[in-house]
């Protein structure tokens, strides 16, 4: 009897039916208390899902008439109606009843979040969590073990393990990215907690190893051979060295440096784009001084975390043999420039001095010398400079010469040096009037009146100050009209020695003056001072005399 004890309405106990059954399953009967068995009552099913079930109209027996899928519909709510066929009316109000579909294990576990991919650092310790995979089973989790899953590893031993109940994948053995950088792990999920008859599903997990800096850079070669020309300027790149690092990315970035270079001639810089070490010339090299060098270079990673320092203890080193290439170098003068001295007035062929250049190369080529800058000098193959003319300091006190040296073996190799020749003074010039004097004396001049102040110059150079001595020539007997007084300051004063002059009788006087210098030996010159008599009028001022003289010359008379 499936009817509830309560008579007021039809409240049915649930019916159950197994899913996925091919045969017709009868699940129970509906019966009205009013049914007396005379077959006048007719039972009917109404509601969604009524098409999946049939009811025997006479007996009220309900049967599933098609295969049911719990995962598609687990519950059918149907309405039942009882009709009295004799009167054609429902004898009771419609009543709902439920048919529950019972689960069978007809669904395998499925991994819904595929594809799975995980990244884990290489050399991670055992037990490190990699990823969790989760499978779903459409069967009823509340019905037995149909949806209770167990996970297992089909591929990935011995490096990985999976927790059976959670699907958590962990590392079970350390892995080295440099040996293998990715692994495919296959995980199986079984329902029925793995019991016989269980269904299973699998998934693949791509596990990539990320790089850690567990490898130090190592030089490709234990010895590098490089060459450098002795003419190479500082800063020249003379070659490259290279190390390799099995790590990748930032972990493979390296820095090269000099470990040993007693000569301190070279440096190494790092090209971070190519990860090469560039050997640089730090100091000029000279084949004649040292024709080969040995340096030791080392290489280290740029970024090394403290915990990975154990992998980076001894830095890799390499030896670099550097051969200096000989270059035929131009001659080298012993001095950058020469200052030579010679007194003026020496005869031609006098030796001024010697310059010297040498071949810095080992073969020591002889030299040839050439001189430019003045025809007053010449040079021989020994570098000796001689005069070709007598030198006069008063014409030129300095000569700026250029001496060129060439190698006899290779005339293309040329060097030049400046030679400055200073011509020394000798006292070969007597002093003379410092200017031309236009001297006038007034007709009405008084005795003792100043007629002219004179000074002298000397073209010679004086180490001390020049000192001039002025004297009236003893031969100048006719000139007692004037008197000379040496002021002792390189000037002298000419004084009138009488009162009054006559322009018509004696218009001009010539006074012979001797000027001597203080050179050794002293030189004296004879100088004539022309003194013109002038009609100055009462003023006794000679300022107008020059104009009068000019007019006189032009044929004019002045009153």
């Amino acid at each position: 009897d499936y009817k509830d004890d309560d008579d007021k309405a039809w409240v049915w106990r649930p019916f159950v039916v197994l899913e996925e059954m091919d045969d017709i399953q009868c699940v129970g009967k509906l019966r009205s208390d009013l049914d007396n068995g005379n077959n006048s009552f007719q039972y009917k099913l109404l509601g969604i899902g009524a098409g999946s079930f049939s009811i025997n109209e006479r007996t009220g027996e309900i049967c599933a008439i098609q295969k049911l899928d719990r995962e598609e519909k687990s519950l059918y709510i149907l309405r039942a109606q009882v009709i009295d066929t004799t009167i054609g009316k429902a004898v009771e109000t419609e009543s709902e009843f439920v048919i529950r579909v019972l689960d069978i294990n007809d669904n395998e576990p499925k991994f819904l979040d595929e594809p799975y991919e995980a990244i884990v650092p290489e050399m991670s310790p055992e037990g490190t969590l990699v990823i969790q995979v989760t499978a779903s089973d459409a069967d009823d989790p509340s019905s037995g073990n149909n949806a209770r899953l167990l996970y297992s590893l089909l591929q990935g031993q011995p490096y990985f393990s999976v927790e059976p109940t959670t699907g958590v994948i962990r590392i079970s053995s350390k892995m080295d990215r440099e040996l293998q950088d990715e692994y495919w792990v296959i995980i199986q999920a079984k329902d029925m907690i793995g019991q016989p008859g269980a269904l299973s599903g699998t998934t693949s997990v791509l596990i990539k190893l990320s790089d850690v800096n567990d490898n130090k850079p190592i030089f490709k070669e234990s010895l590098y051979r490089l060459t450098v020309s002795e003419s190479a300027p500082t800063g020249t790149s003379i070659g490259t060295i290279m190390a390799y690092d099995n790590d990748i990315g930032e972990n493979a970035e390296m820095d090269y440096s000099i470990e040993e270079d007693d000569s301190q001639t070279f440096d190494i810089i790092t090209n971070h784009e190519t990860q090469e070490g560039i050997v640089i010339l730090k100091k000029k090299v000279d084949f004649e001084h040292q024709n080969h060098y040995g340096i030791r270079a080392k290489v280290k990673n740029h970024h090394v975390p403290e915990q990975l320092m154990k992998y980076h203890t001894e830095a890799s080193t390499t030896f670099i043999k550097i051969q200096v290439e000989d270059v035929d170098e131009p001659p080298v003068f012993l001095l950058p420039y020469y200052i030579l001295e010679i007194p003026e007035g020496k005869p031609y062929g006098t030796i001024v001095g010697t310059v010297s250049a040498t071949d810095p190369d080992r073969r020591q080529s002889p030299m040839r010398y050439y001189l430019t800058g003045s025809k007053m000098f010449d040079i021989n193959d020994n570098g000796t400079i001689i005069t070709t003319n007598m030198l006069d300091r008063e014409v030129s006190a300095w000569y700026n010469l250029t001496v060129t040296a060439t190698e006899t073996y290779n005339v293309q190799q040329i060097s030049s040096a400046h030679v400055y020749v200073q011509v020394f003074n000798i006292n070969d010039n007597a002093p003379e009037f410092s200017q031309f004097y236009e001297t006038y004396v007034c007709e009405n001049a008084e005795s003792g009146e100043i007629v002219q102040i004179i000074s002298a110059i000397d073209r010679d150079e004086s180490i001390e100050d020049h000192h001039f001595y002025f004297n009236h020539s003893l031969e100048d007997t006719n000139n007692s009209s004037f008197m000379l007084t040496d002021n002792q300051d390189n000037t002298a004063v000419i004084l009138s020695n009488r009162t009054g002059f006559n322009l018509k009788e004696e218009p001009v006087f010539y006074m012979i003056i001797l000027i001597a210098d203080n050179g050794i030996p002293s030189l004296t010159s004879t100088n004539t001072l022309t003194i013109q008599v002038c009609d100055c009028g009462d003023s006794r001022n000679t300022e107008t005399c020059a104009n009068k003289g000019l007019l006189f010359i032009m044929g004019f008379r002045t009153e």
Partner: antibody
Framework: QVQLVESGGGVVQPGRSLRLSCAAS????????MHWVRQAPGKGLEWVAV????????YYADSVKGRFTISRDTSKNTLYLQMNSLRAEDTAVYYC????????????WGQGTLVSVSS | EIVLTQSPGTLSLSPGERATLSCRAS???????LAWYHQRPGQAPRLLIY???SRATGIPDRFSGSGSGTDFALTISSLEPEDFAVYYC????????FGQGTKVEIK
């Protein structure tokens, strides 16, 4: 083991030529710079010439420059010294020597071959 | 060129005695680029010391080298019969030059 064997020595008149050979074995010949060194009878050692591992560079002592030529044939593992315009003062035992890989000293020497220059 | 002068010219010693040989350079030898060789009569020279103080392969530790710059020395702590030979120093700082040799003879 490393072996260097010189040959080609003999008596020669002044002004004439001679070619010495040095057969190398027991090491990678193409990786080493090679030298010739000579020793006049009863005298000390005198360095003569060097050739680089790849044959691109050669250097000579001033006393032989322009007269002697050093060369090598890697395919035959052989070092040569071509001696022209020979003089009496070139009379000596000629040794070939291998330069140390990480240095410039000579770690292996041949037994030598005697060259006598006389009229 | 760098000239090497060895002294003494001859050293007369008995087996078991200590020998000290000197080598002086006319100018400084860079990076201690100096080697020592010995040569027995009728034989080729043999490398003993390179880099002024490093022993060559197979050379017994009774041989030791020292020095830098212009003054170098080779010491044989206890002479064995086979050590009586001519010893040469060689610089390879600039080209290659040898000293004139020191003869170590049995007293």
């Amino acid at each position: 083991q490393v072996q260097l064997v010189e040959s080609g020595g003999g008596v020669v008149q002044p002004g004439r030529s001679l070619r010495l050979s040095c057969a190398a074995s027991g090491f990678t010949f193409s990786s080493y710079d090679m030298h010739w060194v000579r020793q006049a009878p009863g005298k000390g050692l005198e360095w003569v010439a060097v050739i680089s591992y790849d044959g691109t560079n050669e250097y000579y002592a001033d006393s032989v420059k322009g007269r002697f030529t050093i060369s090598r044939d890697t395919s035959k593992n052989t070092l040569y010294l071509q001696m022209n315009s020979l003089r009496a003062e070139d009379t000596a035992v000629y040794y070939c020597a291998r330069e140390r890989y990480f240095d410039w000293s000579f770690d292996y020497w041949g037994q030598g071959t005697l060259v006598s220059v006389s009229s | 060129e760098i000239v090497l002068t060895q002294s003494p010219g001859t050293l007369s010693l008995s087996p078991g005695e200590r020998a000290t040989l000197s080598c002086r350079a006319s100018q400084s030898v860079s990076n201690t680029y100096l080697a020592w060789y010995h040569q027995r009569p009728g034989q080729a020279p043999r490398l003993l010391i390179y880099g002024a103080s490093s022993r060559a392969t197979g050379i017994p530790d009774r041989f030791s080298g020292s020095g830098s710059g212009t003054d170098f020395a080779l010491t044989i702590s206890s002479l064995e019969p086979e050590d009586f030979a001519v010893y040469y120093c060689q610089q390879y700082s600039n080209s290659w030059t040898f000293g004139q040799g020191t003869k170590v003879e049995i007293k």
